[in-house]
């Protein structure tokens, strides 16, 4: 005759408030004859959770049909879980006896604890933009989870980061916890299209972690490079000078032309193009009138990018005699 074993497979059961908890219990033998009852806690003050034969347990239902002849499954479901339901639950086999049934064997118990899912992680970047090669900090916060154990990872474009510091509060017992992590990220020039991801894994998420993201485009400033060139061909009595502003981000840019130190107000033609890496190029054309009186023209292209100090590039205009002749020839 096989000795009766009471099997409660889960040591810990995490449940959410308002949901239904399933407590598993199976027996390995039908003998001795007698009922299986569920209790919370141990000792004389233990609380009766379910007795199939008598009492009133409106929140409890059985998983299988306890009335079936050879039933060995005494699992129960408890509905509408509240914080008052936490504790350790035992299924206990009794042997029929007189005057009272006698406790025969208890299962090892299943601890029911309240699990609360973490909130969606919120990732915040730096307040001000920073240029490539510098380090910026991102913070990730998630709240309201329980139990305290939680895993947080950082990624940049799918690559896991290692330079971060994480705190879970409070350190003592609590109904819910919060996590805050700060990651240090070195900016690369091509990071306009990059993303940092904060990933939170918790037992209540059943292997489906929550993610919060931040775009590095919010944190990076790629300063432009400037090049001013004179086009070899002239148009009538005008020479075309080009200012190429390359590889900058964000798009916010002011460009002004100066002729021998005097800011030119007249309209200039320009084009804006976006590069594959998310940076921009800006090209501005400036037409300079060529005349005999103007031997040394210095043109300056000045760029103010994203509220930073202006940068400029100068070009001393080369007007050859041949060009002047052509110019005068062209003038009617």
């Amino acid at each position: 005759e096989e000795e009766l074993q009471m099997i409660q497979p889960e040591k810990l059961l995490l449940v959410t408030v308002g949901k239904t908890a399933t407590l598993h219990c199976t027996v390995t033998s039908l003998l001795p004859v007698g009922p299986v009852l569920w209790f919370r806690g141990v000792g004389p003050g233990r609380e009766l959770i379910y007795n199939q034969k008598e009492g009133h347990f409106p929140r409890v239902t059985t998983v299988s049909d306890l009335t079936k002849r050879n039933n060995m499954d005494f699992s129960i479901r408890i509905s509408s879980i509240t914080p008052a339901d936490v504790g350790t639950y035992y299924c206990v086999k009794f042997r029929k006896g007189s005057p009272e049934n006698v406790e025969f064997k208890s299962g090892p118990g299943t601890e029911m604890a309240l699990g609360a899912k973490p909130s969606a992680p919120v990732v915040l970047g730096p307040a001000a933009r920073t240029t490539p090669e510098h380090t910026v900090s991102f913070t990730c916060e998630s709240h309201g989870f329980s139990p305290r154990d939680i895993t947080l990872k950082w990624f940049k474009n799918g690559n896991e980061l290692s330079d971060f510091q994480t705190n879970v509060d409070p350190t003592g017992q609590s109904v819910a916890y919060s996590i805050r992590s700060t990651a240090r990220v070195v900016l690369d020039p091509w990071d306009v299209r990059s993303q940092v991801i904060c990933e939170v894994a918790h037992v209540t998420l059943q292997g489906d972690p929550l993610r919060g993201t931040a775009n590095l485009s919010e944190a990076i400033r790629v300063p432009p490079t400037l090049e001013v060139t004179q086009q070899p061909m002239r148009v009538g009595n005008q020479v075309n000078v080009t200012c190429q502003v390359r590889k900058f981000y964000p798009q916010s840019l002011q460009l002004t032309w100066s002729e021998n130190g005097n800011v030119c107000q007249r309209e200039t033609a320009s084009t804006l193009t976006e590069n594959k890496d998310g940076t921009y190029n800006w090209t501005s054309w400036f037409l300079v009138n060529i005349s005999d009186q103007r031997d040394d023209v210095v043109l300056t292209c000045q760029v103010k990018h994203d509220g930073q100090l202006a940068v400029s590039k100068r070009l001393a205009l080369e007007v050859t005699v041949h060009q002047k002749d052509q110019s005068s020839d062209a003038t009617p």
């Epitope: 004859v33 004389p44 003050g45 233990r46 609380e47 009766l48 199939q52 034969k53 008598e54 009492g55 009133h56 306890l66 009335t67 029929k96 005057p99 009272e100």
Partner: antibody, heavy 113, light 108 residues
Framework: EVQLQQSGAELVKPGASVKLSCTAS????????MHWVKQRTEQGLEWIGR????????KYAPKFQGKATITADTSSNTAYLQLSSLTSEDTAVYYC??????WGQGTLVTVSA | QIVLTQSPAIMSASPGEKVTLTCSAS???????LYWYQQKPGSSPKLWIY???NLASGVPARFSGSGSGTSYSLTISSMEAEDAASYFC?????????FGGGTKLEIK
């Protein structure tokens, strides 16, 4: 819906016996303990005993040992209370209940010569 | 056997008044096994409070139950006319199961 239908009122002579019935609907009696409770006019409730209809096991309050016999017939889904050697002290309303939660409407037993 | 003593045996209360009925056990009763029943004249008892403090279905929220060990109580926060009835405490912690003598609650 759980219902317990008890047999009608009984007028019996002292020394006689009476058998009361309690027929259940909405559940199988073999799945629950069936209890019997006595209530004398304008008085409290007294637990007589109970039966486990699944195997016929019974428990009685010492006061009712020898006075009351509880039986059950699972085929008709009915529990019974037999009272013997009746005296005027046995004049009361007798209730059956399912597992302490659902009660029948009661049966009045009057013992009178 | 466990003897349950209810007090008072009879009491009357005015509408809106707070009412407390007590049930004292001769030896300790686990709170899971202490029930209260309400009974009105000509009707069978109705399960009113189970496991010391849980209200049965349909019982108004003005009712509450508490206690442990040998001392239990049923409280009505604000008496209403429909609460006039007899209330019995009941233990099924050990055989023989026993009932208290009851408290007859009347409305003034």
């Amino acid at each position: 819906e759980v219902q317990l239908q008890q047999s009608g009122a009984e007028l019996v002579k002292p020394g006689a016996s009476v058998k009361l019935s309690c027929t259940a609907s909405g559940f199988n009696i073999k799945d629950y303990y069936m209890h019997w409770v006595k209530q004398r006019t304008e008085q409290g409730l007294e637990w007589i005993g109970r039966i486990d209809p699944e195997d016929g096991e019974t428990k009685y309050a010492p006061k009712f040992q020898g006075k009351a016999t509880i039986t059950a017939d699972t085929s008709s889904n009915t529990a019974y209370l037999q009272l013997s050697s009746l005296t005027s002290e046995d004049t009361a309303v007798y209730y059956c209940d399912r597992g302490l939660a659902y009660w029948g409407q009661g049966t009045l037993v009057t013992v009178s010569a | 056997q466990i003897v349950l003593t209810q007090s008072p045996a009879i009491m009357s209360a005015s509408p809106g008044e707070k009412v407390t009925l007590t049930c004292s056990a001769s030896s300790s009763v686990s709170s899971s096994y202490l029930y209260w029943y309400q009974q009105k004249p000509g009707s069978s008892p109705k399960l009113w409070i189970y496991s010391t403090s849980n209200l049965a279905s349909g019982v108004p929220a003005r009712f509450s139950g508490s206690g442990s060990g040998t001392s239990y109580s049923l409280t009505i926060s604000s008496m209403e006319a429909e609460d006039a009835a007899s209330y019995f405490c009941h233990q099924w912690s050990s055989y023989p199961y026993t009932f208290g003598g009851g408290t007859k609650l009347e409305i003034k």
